[in-house]
């Protein structure tokens, strides 16, 4: 188990226990209970109070990070007396040994890389392990392929994201023969960590007066539909003076992605490239390959 649990309790204890795998806090049921509540307080004095489970002798915390250390508290009243018990959940191990600079990104719609750095005070034999649990906590994913630096795990590559949901809990545990290693945990939204591919199937068709650009929305890990996308088109006249402004056009996603613009013959050589983003986050993809149209003698 990743941390010491210390109980602060009066003589007759509720025997409060916490399972970090399921994020479930439980205690001994008391006869004739009239009131019970559980909550945690973090290092910034923020309080999180989840709903009690049906049996009223446990509660499950949904979206919490524990690496800064928290204190759980249970209050129970019975028809005879009141009980209160605190459970300290520190992040035991030497300060500064936990993995740091942790980040993940999803790319190519179904791949994910997570990276981290070794803690500044971590010993040379430190080894880190990544575990991921989805918001439904139905299954735990262990890192299948570690990225290593001098034998130490400093990243993870996943090529199967089927176990993820929209919000996921990431835990990096550490081990060493020398000292205790602190853990690091984080909650990440897949929406916020996905890097889109550029739009595909970009085509340009011109008639005597106009050019029509068409493209397909990128394949994404998240289930997105056409209104969730924003596009930017860079229509660029070739062989212009350096410093000439490119024409950047913003286009909202549509069922049929297209942009029609006036361009009469004879037309000079142009290029067009497109990038995509989530309309709410505007985390732009890289640009698509430039498509050329028009002629050198236009």
């Amino acid at each position: 188990e990743k941390s010491d649990l210390r109980t602060v309790a009066p003589a007759s204890s509720l025997n409060v226990r916490f399972d970090s795998r399921t994020m479930n806090l439980s205690w001994d049921c008391q006869e004739n209970t009239t009131f019970s509540k559980c909550f945690l307080t973090d290092k910034k004095n923020r309080v999180v109070e989840p709903r009690l489970s049906n049996n009223e002798c446990s509660c499950t915390f949904r979206e919490i990070c524990l690496h800064e250390g928290v204190t759980f508290e249970v209050h129970v009243n019975t028809s005879q007396r009141g009980f209160q018990q605190k459970l300290l959940y520190p992040n035991s191990g030497r300060e500064g040994t936990a993995a740091q600079n942790f980040s993940c990104f999803i790319y190519n719609a179904d791949l994910m890389n997570c990276t981290w750095a070794r803690g500044p005070t971590a010993p040379r034999d430190v080894q880190y392990f990544l575990y991921i649990r989805n918001s439904k906590r139905r299954r735990e994913i262990r890192c299948p392929y570690y990225i290593q630096d001098s034998g130490t795990h400093v990243g993870c590559h996943l090529d199967n994201l089927s176990g993820l949901t929209s919000r996921n809990y990431f835990l990096v545990n550490g081990t060493s023969r020398e000292i205790g290693i602190q853990f690091f945990d984080s909650l990440l939204d897949t929406k916020k960590i996905e890097r889109f591919n550029p739009p595909s199937n970009v085509t340009v068709r011109c008639n005597t007066t106009h050019c029509l650009v068409r493209w397909k929305q990128p394949r994404t890990y998240q289930k997105l539909s056409y209104l969730d996308f924003q596009y930017q088109l860079d229509v660029h006249r070739k062989n212009t003076q350096p410093g000439t402004e490119n024409l950047l056009i913003n286009v909202s996603g549509d069922l049929e992605n297209r942009y029609n613009f006036p361009s009469s013959e004879p037309r000079a050589k142009h290029s067009v490239k497109i990038r995509a983003a989530d309309v709410r986050i505007l985390n732009w993809s890289s640009w698509s390959e430039a498509i050329e149209f028009g002629s050198d003698d236009g």
Partner: antibody, heavy 120, light 111 residues
């Protein structure tokens, strides 16, 4: 211009079933998600169900659970709504709609609607 | 009874600005879930006007704008025109009902 083509009006007796179709010409149903919504003068719009990406399956509104089935035939790009054990208060215009956004569900394009009348 | 509450009607003269309110609760608009707005002309299917609280699909004129605050949202139509005469509906998601919810609709009359 993309259009959703719905089947024609139906008149049904109480306790019967009705099946409404919704075709998307020129578009692959496998790349789109369809939801069904009905409209009555008294209750207004009522969401009936549709594809939920988080569950990766079709989900139904609680009040229609057990009476409604939504199916798709991707080979002909057609979605179907079947409502059974019809009652007079199921008389409504039934719309299929393409999901334009999933967060939360937004209906980007609606079919013209299918009038279903339940009368003895 | 609609989950989201809208005024049953509003009216204005051509060129005027009218607003329509949509009030929800902590399980829908205040959760917070985004709001969409639809226009339904007499005898036709609804048409999407606004999504993600304030974004317009291509082809919707910028006379239509919307905003959201807390558990309420509003749609504004500036430079009111005769062909804006229609029913307008707000829509969001409700976590307690696990599905889409709609307002009862507002009839806009151009005097």
């Amino acid at each position: 211009q993309v259009q959703l083509v719905q089947s024609g009006a139906e008149v049904k007796k109480p306790e019967a079933s009705v099946k409404v179709s919704c075709k998307i010409p020129g578009h692959s149903l496998s790349e789109l998600s369809i939801h069904w919504v009905r409209q009555t003068p008294t209750k207004g719009f009522e969401w009936m169900g549709g594809f939920d990406p988080e569950e990766n399956e079709i989900v139904y509104a609680q009040r229609f659970q057990g009476r409604v089935t939504m199916t798709e035939d991707t080979s002909i790009d057609t979605a179907y709504l079947t409502l059974s054990s019809l009652r007079s208060d199921d008389t409504a215009v039934y719309y299929c709609a393409i999901v334009g956004s999933f967060s939360p569900i937004t209906y980007g394009l609606w079919g013209k609607g299918t009038m279903v009348t339940v009368s003895s | 009874q609609a989950v989201l509450t809208q005024p049953s009607s509003v009216s204005g003269v051509p060129g005027q600005r009218v607003t329509i309110s949509c009030t929800g609760s902590g399980s829908n608009i205040g959760a917070p879930y985004d709001v969409s707005w639809y226009q339904q002309l007499p005898g036709t299917a609804p048409k999407l006007l606004i999504y993600h609280n304030n974004k317009r699909p291509s082809g919707v004129p910028d006379r239509f704008s919307a905003s959201k605050s807390g558990t309420s949202a509003s749609l504004a139509i500036t430079g009111l025109q005769a062909d804006d005469e229609a029913d307008y509906y707000c829509q969001s998601y409700d976590s307690s009902l696990s599905g889409s919810v709609f307002g009862g609709g507002t009839k806009v009359t151009v005097l």
